[in-house]
């Protein structure tokens, strides 16, 4: 499904005030002690990654017992492990009570800039994408993903963090936005609406999609998330819109079928490893890209957003399961967990393909108003 040319559709801003960005990208891993060399963290040592900062939660420095032996992604070792195979995990266990950024919610108080001043920044996310105004940039090559196909064991941690459902990803998932722009995946999470109300974060010409997946990555130039926050290109998020289609999506079903187990806020379960790339569109060559922020506190800027042109299809039942199963804080349903779109403030969205060219026969001669800023660097 390519992104349709949308009519202005009043965004059903699902209870999300301009600053409802849940922690910048859900839950960035927190700092934890590395495991004893002889005890690589096991599958259940996976951090809940429930705590990626901002996009659902930023990491906080919190020591972890050696017994649990789980490195967090920030402490990924170099390729050649010096000791017994250690198993760095994207640990995101944070003591939320001690984290000011944990006290935020979608809509209402406190205003996000009070939670994190960065949420009032000029270059925030999400944004409304207007293909006709996007700058075609031939230098944007197809994305490259490596190691995203995971065997069923060890299992991965799936968590309801009160803001989203988040899957912690193991080390070794590598993504390249282009030559020299390399990243490691940390976690993925979803944003959705409610019955009859779409809940994607990004919009296309004002059209909001039913849901959106975010796969959060840390640049290989940084060892830890807290070092990368706010640094240009320090974090990168792959985003794809989820739409209703006629068939069940078997890749998503592996996660959606487990949501009942984590209906309660703060609960988590273990799920078999799966092909993470199957959760994304198949066309890695056509996408929009811009620099923005985490969409939840701390709303750190410098995040490279890549939004796929192709959408992912889920059945109506699956979309209903996503939006109607989980509970958030205060005995309220976890729904409409998206932030309102933010002003571009002069930013130009780039496209890896001539998005301004409408393929429909009635289209007028397209006018590409913006030119590509990237020169391939």
């Amino acid at each position: 499904q390519r992104l349709p040319r949308m009519q202005e559709d009043s965004p059903l801003g699902g209870g999300s005030s301009g600053e409802d960005d849940p922690l910048g990208e859900e839950d960035l891993p927190s700092e934890e002690d590395s495991p004893r060399e002889e005890d690589p963290p096991g599958e259940e040592d996976l951090p809940g990654e429930e705590d990626l900062p901002g996009e659902e939660d930023l990491p906080e420095v919190k020591p972890k017992s050696e017994e649990e032996g789980s490195l967090k992604l920030e402490d990924l070792p170099t390729v050649e492990a010096p000791g017994d195979p250690q198993e760095p995990q994207n640990n995101a266990h944070r003591d939320k009570e001690g984290d000011d950024q944990s006290h935020w919610r979608y809509g209402g108080d406190p205003p996000w800039p009070r939670v994190s001043p960065a949420c009032a920044g000029r270059f925030q996310s999400p944004v409304d994408i207007r293909p006709q105004l996007a700058a075609f940039c031939p230098a944007l090559r197809p994305l490259e993903l490596l190691g995203f196909q995971l065997p069923p064991l060890p299992e991965l941690r799936l968590r309801n963090n009160g803001h989203s459902v988040q899957l912690t990803l193991p080390p070794g998932l590598e993504m390249a936005l282009g030559p020299g722009r390399e990243y490691r995946a940390l976690q993925l999470h979803l944003h959705w609406g409610a019955a009859g109300r779409p809940g994607s974060e990004h919009t296309v010409e004002g059209h909001r999609f039913p849901a959106e997946i975010h796969v959060v990555h840390l640049s290989t130039a940084f060892a830890r998330v807290d070092e990368a926050l706010g640094r240009p290109g320090g974090l990168a998020v792959l985003a794809a819109f989820l739409e209703e289609g006629p068939e069940e999506n078997s890749a998503y079903e592996q996660l959606l079928s487990r949501l009942e187990e984590i209906a309660e806020e703060g609960s988590e379960t273990q799920v078999p490893g799966l092909d993470i790339s199957a959760l994304l569109p198949s066309d890695f060559s056509r996408y929009f890209q811009y620099e923005g922020s985490l969409t939840t506190p701390p709303c750190a800027q410098g995040v490279i957003w890549t939004v796929f042109n192709q959408t992912v299809m889920l059945s109506a039942k699956q979309l209903h399961t996503l939006s109607d199963t989980l509970w958030g804080p205060g005995d309220s349903r976890l729904q409409l967990n998206f932030r309102a779109t933010q002003p571009l403030n002069g930013r130009v969205i780039e496209a890896s393909f001539p998005a301004g060219v409408d393929s429909s026969p009635r289209a007028a001669e397209p006018v590409q108003l913006n030119s590509c800023l990237a020169a391939g660097d």
Partner: antibody
Framework: QVQLVQSGGGLVQPGGSLRLSCAAS????????MTWVRQAPGKGLEWVSA????????YYADSVKGRFTISRDNSRNTLYLQMNSLRADDTAVYYC????????????WGQGTMVTVSS | QSVLTQPPSVSGAPGQRITISCTGS?????????VHWYQQLPGTAPKLLIY???NRPSGVPGRFSASKSGTSASLAISGLQAEDEADYYC???????????FGGGTKLAVL
């Protein structure tokens, strides 16, 4: 030091049963997936079965499905392989191994225990 | 017949460099699953030699290296020593079989 100590092998008649045990020490047993691998005399390694850290998910090779059952007792730090309806071609050295561990495969192995199925 | 194909045997003189190939398919190595290598000395249990395609655990000499490309992988041993005489196995996961799979093993003889 991290180790896996196996027991329970022996001679059994075709159609018989046997239970292998694998005792783990010096690591947090319940956080690791565990696996059984076997090696027939003079042959290569063959994956048999695996279980998640919690014991909630189990996996089997087609050759043993329906006959073998993998289980674990995390309170005792012990892995088990219950083998029923044994056949001559099940004769092998059986190894328990820690893993698959994220990106590390099977990183710690038991010493192996011989299972002979013969009449 | 093993899902991952290895040569049954290789040999080399001390000090030489040898390689052992491991050929799979699009449902295992080619599907981007990690490849691990194990060394089994005579009469002992296998030992992890290389993990995640090209990484050495501590205690494994730098003479051992490995790589992966497409649907195959290879193990290289340089500066061959007598104590390297053993059986070597590659291992991965196969999404079609839904099983962890091993190569048939390669017997290394140091002449």
């Amino acid at each position: 030091q991290v180790q896996l100590v196996q027991s329970g092998g022996g001679l059994v008649q075709p159609g018989g049963s046997l239970r292998l045990s694998c005792a783990a020490s010096e690591f947090t047993f319940g956080t690791y997936a565990m696996t059984w691998v076997r090696q027939a005399p003079g042959k290569g390694l063959e994956w048999v079965s695996a279980v998640s850290g919690s014991g909630g998910s189990t996996y089997y090779a087609d050759s043993v499905k329906g006959r073998f059952t993998i289980s674990r007792d995390n309170s005792r730090n012990t892995l088990y392989l219950q083998m029923n309806s044994l056949r001559a071609d099940d004769t092998a050295v059986y190894y328990c191994a820690r893993g698959p561990v994220l990106r590390y495969g099977f990183d710690i192995w038991g010493q192996g225990t011989m299972v002979t199925v013969s009449s | 017949q093993s899902v991952l194909t290895q040569p049954p045997s290789v040999s080399g003189a001390p000090g030489q460099r040898i390689t052992i190939s491991c050929t799979g398919s699009r449902s295992n190595i080619g599907a981007d699953y990690d490849v691990h290598w194990y060394q089994q000395l005579p009469g002992t249990a296998p030992k992890l030699l290389i993990y995640a395609n090209n990484n050495r655990p501590s205690g494994v000499p730098g003479r051992f290296s490995a790589s992966k490309s497409g649907t195959s992988a290879s193990l290289a041993i340089s500066g061959l020593q007598a104590e390297d005489e053993a059986d070597y196995y590659c291992q991965s996961y196969d999404s079609s079989l839904r099983a962890w799979v091993f190569g048939g093993g390669t017997k290394l003889a140091v002449l």
